[in-house]
Amino acid sequence: REEEKPFRDCADVYQAGFNKSGIYTIYINNMPEPKKVFCNMDVNGGGWTVIQHREDGSLDFQRGWKEYKMGFGNPSGEYWLGNEFIFAITSQRQYMLRIELMDWEGNRAYSQYDRFHIGNEKQNYRLYLKGHTGTAGKQSSLILHGADFSTKDADNDNCMCKCALMLTGGWWFDACGPSNLNGMFYTAGQNHGKLNGIKWHYFKGPSYSLRSTTMMIRPLDF
């Protein structure tokens, strides 16, 4: 049965013959418990482990360091996998990151990074990225030179302000940077002119709040 297989990530799940998108259990190196994740087996060849998803505003993303560390929400809907799990997964082997976005007009776009991993908790889950491509802007809306993760109770940004408090959500803020996919969810008609919304600057500008987002990772050698 699927539960008995020691899948490290959704790539392992896919390669074991499970090619249907859905919730699977993975066993991450150095983590004491298995973790349920959503596996996207449809996009760009499949095998993607979803680490973040927003779609309807049903889940509060304005949370503290501990919750962003261990994750919250449900893989069947909106959720954040957890920084500790993201760190552990991306320490297993080399991963790429793909971010799927949709605006309120139904336009879809993506950003993809050839290399993605984050540091450990002592390193404030610092973001490491290389090789940006995609349709969600010529420039990267994630900080390529590295940024620490901040939450409302852990101010690790590069600003005299407190980005996570002002813009809401936990994220790799700079000062405060060109993105925040964990910002406030605003519905259609209310999503313009929002500094604290779900932002991807080089897709829709600095104050447009997006309708849905998915962050997912896959091994480089998939």
Epitope: C159, C161, D174, A175, C176, L195, P206, S207
Partner: antibody
């Protein structure tokens, strides 16, 4: 460490020109909107001009419009204020200031230069 | 242009005592973004101004917690819970909701 180091001030006769410079370091200059703010001797603060991170958006105070030109060179991490047709009332300490937030999101001035005195006198 | 009116213009305070500065704007500063674009700056003698409070009530990093900002719309207040000798200087409020940005006249805080 964020630093804004100014130069170019001095004494100049009315009607003449002067160019102020502001050299930035310690941050990604090309990501921030920049401003010039001035302070006449013994007076309060007055906003003068703004330029967006890419240089595509520029604003001036009515008091300097048509006489002053703000510009930036992101490759050199530098901000400039070209002041022409100077008047006695332009006498002030001029400060360059950086937006608190990047990507042209306005929330005020996070960092200020040390100021440079411009004296317009015959 | 938006007129910013501060009071008092001069504020002598005994160390350890509280202090309060008022700032009124000629129009509401509540932006459609949901923020009041109202900052407070302190200019110490012989120095450049420094940011104390942004967006009406948010303390800038490194600013002691004895400083607090409050208010919305047209009325704003900067409070210092216990004044210290290093707090002397001129305090300015500044609005950025309506272009151009405008400053108050300044309030000079001095130690009694």
């Amino acid at each position: 460490e964020v630093q804004l180091v100014q130069s170019g001030g001095g004494v100049v006769q009315p009607g003449r020109s002067l160019r102020l410079s502001c050299a930035a370091s310690g941050f990604t200059f090309s990501s921030y909107g920049m401003h010039w703010v001035r302070q006449a001797p013994g007076k309060g603060l007055e906003w003068v001009s703004y330029i967006s991170s890419s240089g595509s958006t520029i604003y001036y105070a009515d008091s300097v419009k048509g006489r002053f030109t703000i510009s930036r060179d992101n490759a050199k991490n530098s901000l400039y204020l070209q002041m022409n047709s100077l008047r006695a009332e332009d006498t002030a300490v001029y400060y360059c200031a950086r937006d608190l937030l990047d990507y042209d999101i306005w929330t005020g001035y996070g960092y200020w230069g040390q100021g440079t005195l411009v004296t317009v006198s015959s | 242009d938006i007129v910013m009116t501060q009071s008092p213009l001069s504020l002598p305070v005994t160390p350890g005592e509280p202090a309060s500065i008022s700032c009124r704007s000629s129009q509401s500063l509540l932006h459609s973004h949901g923020y009041n674009y109202l900052d407070w700056y302190l200019q110490k003698p012989g120095q450049s101004p420094q940011l104390l409070i942004y967006l009406g009530s948010n303390r800038a990093s490194g600013v002691p917690d004895r400083f607090s900002g409050s208010g919305s719309g047209t009325d704003f207040t900067l409070k210092i819970s216990r004044v210290e000798a290093e707090d002397v200087g001129v305090y300015y409020c500044m609005q950025g909701t309506h272009w151009p940005p405008t400053f108050g006249q300044g309030t000079k805080l001095e130690i009694k």
